[in-house]
Interface confidence: medium
C-alpha cells in the first residue's frame, strides 16, 4: 500500500526528520511549512494550523526557503566607487562591486563593503603583481636594464632599448637614448628631413624599422647619394 502523505502540520515519526521545505518547530513539536523565497513567516504554525506566509516589504528580501519572522533588509545603496551588479528584489539582496581601477579592501558575504583605489606604481617602479577584484597592485623597483617612466597601476618594467651607440644611458625611470653613428654631412641640395621611425610601446619610445608605426619625429637624417650608414636608424 502507498504510504500516507502527511499534510503540514504533522508530528514526525520518532527519529525521522521533516521533509524538504519543511521545518521542525521545537515548541509545537510539529513539521511545518517553510515560506518560499520572497516571503516570510507572518504566523507560525500550531498543532492544528500551518505557517502563514506573507510577501517581503519593499527593500527587504529572503533568498531561501525560510521561516523567519521578518525579511532581511537589503544593503544600503552602492557608494560612488561601486557598481550595483545585482539590484535589491524581494528574493535577493543588492550586490555592490568595485568599479574599474578599484579593488575590494573589505568584502562581505556577497559583494564588497569597502573599495579602495588600485595602487599606482611611480616611475622607476613597475607592476610585480596586478590588482584583482580583492587585492591591490604590488609594485617592485625596476631591475637593472629595465625601466618604467609612467605612474600606472598596470605598466610593468620594460627592457631598455638596445643601442649600437648610447647617447644617454637608461635608468630605472628612463629608457636609453640612442645616437646615430653616421658621419655628419652637410645637407645636400634637396635634402629631405626624414622622421626617425618610432614605435609606441605602452608610452615608452623605442626605434623600430617599420615606418607604419612612426607617429613622432625623433632625429633628422641627411638624404645623400649613398645609403645611410649602419645604425643611423638608431638601432
Amino acid at each position: 500500500l502507498p504510504a500516507q502523505v502527511a499534510f503540514t502540520p504533522y508530528a514526525p515519526e520518532p527519529g525521522s526528520t521533516c521533509r524538504l521545505r519543511e521545518y521542525y518547530d521545537q515548541t509545537a513539536q510539529m513539521c511545518c511549512s517553510k515560506c518560499s523565497p520572497g516571503q516570510h513567516a507572518k504566523v507560525f504554525c500550531t498543532k492544528t494550523s500551518d505557517t502563514v506566509c506573507d510577501s517581503c516589504e519593499d527593500s527587504t528580501y529572503t533568498q531561501l526557503w525560510n521561516w523567519v519572522p521578518e525579511c532581511l533588509s537589503c544593503g544600503s545603496r552602492c557608494s560612488s566607487d561601486q557598481v550595483e551588479t545585482q539590484a535589491c528584489t524581494r528574493e535577493q539582496n543588492r550586490i555592490c562591486t568595485c568599479r574599474p581601477g578599484w579593488y575590494c579592501a573589505l568584502s562581505k558575504q556577497e559583494g564588497c563593503r569597502l573599495c579602495a583605489p588600485l595602487r599606482k606604481c611611480r616611475p622607476g617602479f613597475g607592476v610585480a603583481r596586478p590588482g584583482t577584484e580583492t587585492s591591490d597592485v604590488v609594485c617592485k623597483p625596476c631591475a637593472p636594464g629595465t625601466f618604467s617612466n609612467t605612474t600606472s597601476s598596470t605598466d610593468i618594467c620594460r627592457p631598455h632599448q638596445i643601442c649600437n651607440v648610447v647617447a644617454i644611458p637608461g635608468n630605472a625611470s628612463m629608457d636609453a637614448v640612442c645616437t646615430s653613428t653616421s658621419p655628419t654631412r652637410s645637407m645636400a641640395p634637396g635634402a629631405v628631413h626624414l622622421p626617425q621611425p618610432v614605435s609606441t610601446r605602452s608610452q615608452h619610445t623605442q626605434p623600430t624599422p617599420e615606418p607604419s608605426t612612426a607617429p613622432s619625429t625623433s632625429f633628422l637624417l641627411p638624404m645623400g647619394p649613398s645609403p645611410p650608414a649602419e645604425g643611423s636608424t638608431g638601432d
Partner: nanobody, 120 residues
C-alpha cells in the same frame, strides 16, 4: 554557539512546587522558542512545556493546569513554574533554545539538564 544554564531543580515532596530557570547566552540574536523537555531512564526526551517568541505555548497533557511556562526576552531566560508536583514528574529536565537567526538558524541547543525528584 548558544550556552544554556539551568537552575532550580532538586528534591521536593509530592504536592510541592519548584521553579526552574534557564538562561541563554552566547550568539543570541533571535529565538524561535525556548522550553523544557523531560527525560526519565529508559525513555526519550519529551516536551514538558515550550514558549515561542510569538507567545504560542505548548504543554504536555500530563502537566496542563499544574505547570506554567513564561519567558523574559530581555534576559533571554525561560521559567517553568511547577505546582502540585507528582512522583511521575520526576526526571532530568533539559532546557532547549531554538535559534531563529544566523549563524545558527533553525538549530536547537540544549542545556546540561537539572534533576527534579518528587518523593511520595
Amino acid at each position: 554557539e548558544v550556552q544554556l544554564v539551568e537552575s532550580g531543580g532538586g528534591l521536593v515532596q509530592a504536592g510541592g512546587s519548584l521553579r526552574l530557570s534557564c538562561a541563554a547566552s552566547g550568539s543570541i540574536v533571535s529565538t524561535n522558542g525556548m522550553g523544557w523537555h523531560r527525560q526519565v531512564p529508559g525513555k526519550g526526551r519529551e516536551l514538558v512545556a515550550g514558549i515561542r517568541s510569538d507567545g504560542f505555548t505548548n504543554y504536555a497533557d500530563s502537566v496542563k493546569g499544574r505547570f506554567t511556562i513564561s519567558s523574559d526576552n530581555v534576559k533571554n531566560t525561560v521559567y517553568l513554574q511547577m505546582n502540585s508536583l507528582k512522583a511521575e514528574d520526576s526526571g532530568v529536565y533539559f532546557c532547549y533554545y531554538q535559534a531563529l537567526s544566523s549563524p545558527n538558524y533553525g538549530q536547537t541547543f540544549w542545556g546540561q539538564g537539572t534533576q527534579v525528584t518528587v518523593s511520595s
